[in-house]
Amino acid sequence: HTAAQDNCTCPTNKMTVCSPDGPGGRCQCRALGSGMAVDCSTLTSKCLLLKARMSAPKNARTLVRPSEHALVDNDGLYDPDCDPEGRFKARQCNQTSVCWCVNSVGVRRTDKGDLSLRCDELVRTHHILIDLRHRPTAGAFNHSDLDAELRRLFRERYRLHPKFVAAVHYEQPTIQIELRQNTSQKAAGDVDIGDAAYYFERDIKGESLFQGRGGLDLRVRGEPLQVERTLIYYLDEIPPKFSMKRLTA
């Protein structure tokens, strides 16, 4: 059998190497960069995806690192340390021993320090606000149709339970999607809102992480919804700890 016939690939993560060397010759996939085994029936964690992205050849990366002064690093382009479950380690450091604390979506939440910096726990991002601007259309989308389509998208494409899509707001051309998921609400097996938001972000940018599943085909009553700008805001269960100097910059 050829590889194409066996089709040993990871539908939910193209940044993997797969081979039929699992139990009973079953397809087993490992994330690039970390070599960790991934569950291809659900989303891969953002930490493993970022690590895989950084391990790819530099010319394969199409996005530019945000400026050092960016308040929110939406792309999070650094080579993260992930724990054995694939989550971000609370403390991240670079090769020059500069360290900082991150939240559960890997976004920096403290000033940068040295190796003595302590990050006692991984603080959960429990509220994500995805702010979109869609391209001009003949008329505004019907709000309830738009709401239903986006909830469907998060449930069917990203496997996120509808209860975690708190609200969809719309004032043409701005769409806001609120995702909420407290530590107490997230059960084992639930997709994390941070992972769903990251997959959505990459889909919107035309950089789908799905293998062979095609790009995002987002339609409201048959009318294509094309996004021209995305901003993502993260709120943590514990407020971030930046110095006043950073806050007034």
């Epitope: 029936s41 469907r152 069917e156 496997r159 339970h161 059960a187 599943r213 095609g214």
Partner: antibody, heavy 116, light 108 residues
Framework: QVQLQESGPGLVKPSGTLSLTCAVS?????????WSWVRQPPGKGLEWIGE???????DYNPSLKSRVIISVDKSKNQFSLKVRSVTAADTAVYYC?????????WGQGTLVTVSS | EIVLTQFPGTLSLSPGERATLSCRSS???????LAWYQQKPGQAPRLLIS???SRATGIPDRFSGSGSGTDFTLTISRLEPEDFAVYYC?????????FGQGTKVEIK
């Protein structure tokens, strides 16, 4: 490898209640998937009955909603189907399936006949 | 409810031939939410294609899916003896999930 196995009586009397259970092995029911019931009358096509998430959230086919209850037992890694007030039209092969970008895993199906 | 109509109802072909099966939806379905299944007598359906074009694990590359909006196609490039079966399309983009009535691919 996820495996699903339906079990329950093969014969139910008219106006009675059809009860089936689907045991999930090789994977946890507490995953990001929904778990479905689908039926197929003899010689006919497939009809989706409804589905459940591990937290007990359900979604039913409106054509059957008034007669159907789907429940989950996480401790036993199984989910169940009850259809009340059955008639001969409910005679079918009943399948349980995992809903994960389409129904990617199915039980082998169990024939339930409604007859007195 | 989205109604899916499959045609032809029966397709009579010989092994080695190309099979083209169609599925039409009563309203627009995002291509992300369309699947195809194969069912043989006495067996459960088997997922072939999801997201209109993505082959499921273990499905041979002679099976391919395409389409968008209201028209979708399943193509079997060269029929093997084991491919003679009933094929169903299904949409999972809105509730209730619905199936087409099926296309039977039989040996000519």
């Amino acid at each position: 490898q996820v495996q699903l196995q339906e079990s329950g009586p093969g014969l139910v009397k008219p106006s009675g209640t059809l009860s089936l259970t689907c045991a999930v092995s090789g994977g946890s029911i507490s995953s990001s998937n929904w778990w479905s019931w689908v039926r197929q009358p003899p010689g006919k096509g497939l009809e989706w009955i409804g589905e459940i998430y591990h937290d007990g959230s359900t979604d039913y086919n409106p054509s059957l909603k008034s007669r159907v209850i789907i429940s989950v037992d996480k401790s036993k890694n199984q989910f169940s189907l009850k259809v009340r007030s059955v008639t001969a039209a409910d005679t079918a092969v009943y399948y349980c399936a995992r809903d994960n970008w389409g129904f990617d895993y199915w039980g082998q199906g169990t024939l339930v006949t409604v007859s007195s | 409810e989205i109604v899916l109509t499959q045609f032809p109802g029966t397709l009579s072909l010989s092994p080695g031939e190309r099979a083209t099966l169609s599925c039409r939806s009563s309203q627009s379905v995002s291509s992300s939410y369309l699947a195809w299944y194969q069912q043989k007598p006495g067996q459960a359906p088997r997922l072939l294609i999801s997201g209109a074009s993505s082959r499921a694990t273990g499905i041979p590359d002679r099976f391919s899916g395409s389409g968008s909006g209201t028209d979708f196609t399943l193509t079997i490039s060269r029929l093997e003896p084991e491919d003679f079966a009933v094929y169903y399309c299904q949409q999972y983009g809105s509730s209730p999930r619905t199936f087409g009535q099926g296309t039977k691919v039989e040996i000519k």
